[in-house]
């Protein structure tokens, strides 16, 4: 099939890099300053992205691939092939529509991005809060009220501090 | 193709105005958020102002607050920033940039943005 489909389709035989030109009897020309065809057999090529105000280029673009972007310093990318840039805040803030604001008491964010998320319930777990919660960081829960009363054979070590899951962007 | 074109940059004196203007082309700019960006020399990019997509609410960056204004004409897709009482620290390269449908990823994430407009506030 391939044999047969290049032998009635020139335009198959033009590798990446370049397209076949309509105007120019179907022959294989380079693909213009600034355009791309990443697979063969191509009737145009396509226009390369800019990356230019909060993009900055980290691949420039050949006649054979696309330009890739990613954010300027203070932003970060979102979305398939960094569609777009957000602003990054501090540890212990979320974006809001104002900008960057601090976690509400009782909530914390350890990244530069996402959101503020509750701080851990430990009693849930029948455990007791061994390192308070703050802006940035979760609370570390210990071992159980029953295990420090002085009854007890032996002191569980302390659970490691929960690994909060990514928020959804 | 998606355009976004500012103007009305220049050099001004500290406590004057000057209105940046952005010219928006290839999308349907009724349906997005809008933002002001800012560079200013040997600094990161600094969010200014965003705007939703029917001017009803407007977010500003504390620094600017009460001193610019943000607004849009969707009727000639065009936004605007009107800078009054400028200060030195205001001098930066000003970026407008399209934000989030109601649809998108992030309302707050930028996905297009212009070539800039510089501004100059100097004694």
């Known amino acids: 099939f391939e044999r047969t489909r290049s032998l009635q389709d020139p335009c198959s035989n033009c590798p990446a890099g370049t397209f076949c030109d309509n105007n120019r009897n179907q022959i294989c020309s380079p693909c213009p300053p600034n355009s791309f065809s990443s697979a063969g057999g191509q009737r145009t090529c396509d226009i390369c992205r800019q990356c230019k105000g909060v993009f900055r280029t980290r691949k420039e673009c050949s006649s054979t691939s696309n330009a890739e972007c990613d954010c300027t310093p203070g932003f970060h990318c979102l979305g398939a092939g960094c569609s777009m840039c957000e602003q990054d805040c501090k540890q212990g803030q979320e974006l809001t529509k104002k900008g960057c604001k601090d976690c509400c008491f009782g909530t914390f964010n350890d990244q530069k991005r996402g959101i503020c998320r509750p701080w851990t319930n430990c009693s849930l777990d029948g455990k007791s809060v061994l390192v308070n919660g703050t802006k940035e960081r979760d609370v570390v829960c210990g071992p159980s009220p029953a295990d420090l009363s002085p009854g007890a054979s032996s002191v569980t070590p302390p659970a490691p501090a929960r690994e909060p899951g990514h928020s959804p962007q | 193709e998606v355009q976004l074109v500012e103007s009305g940059g220049g050099l001004v004196q500290i406590g004057g105005s000057l209105r940046l203007s952005c010219a928006a082309s290839g999308f349907t700019f009724s349906k997005y958020w809008m933002i002001w960006v800012r560079q200013a020399p040997e600094k990161g990019l600094e969010w200014?102002?965003?705007?939703?997509?029917?001017?009803?609410?407007?977010y500003y960056v504390d620094s600017v607050e009460g001193r610019f204004t943000i607004s849009r004409d969707n009727a000639n897709n065009s936004l605007f920033l009107q800078m009054n009482s400028l200060r030195a620290e205001d001098t930066a390269v000003y970026y407008c940039a399209r934000g989030g449908d109601d649809y998108s990823i992030s309302h707050f994430g930028m996905d297009v943005s212009g070539q800039g407009t510089r501004v100059t506030v100097s004694s």
């Open positions: 200014v102002a965003n705007i939703n997509q029917d001017g009803s609410e407007k």
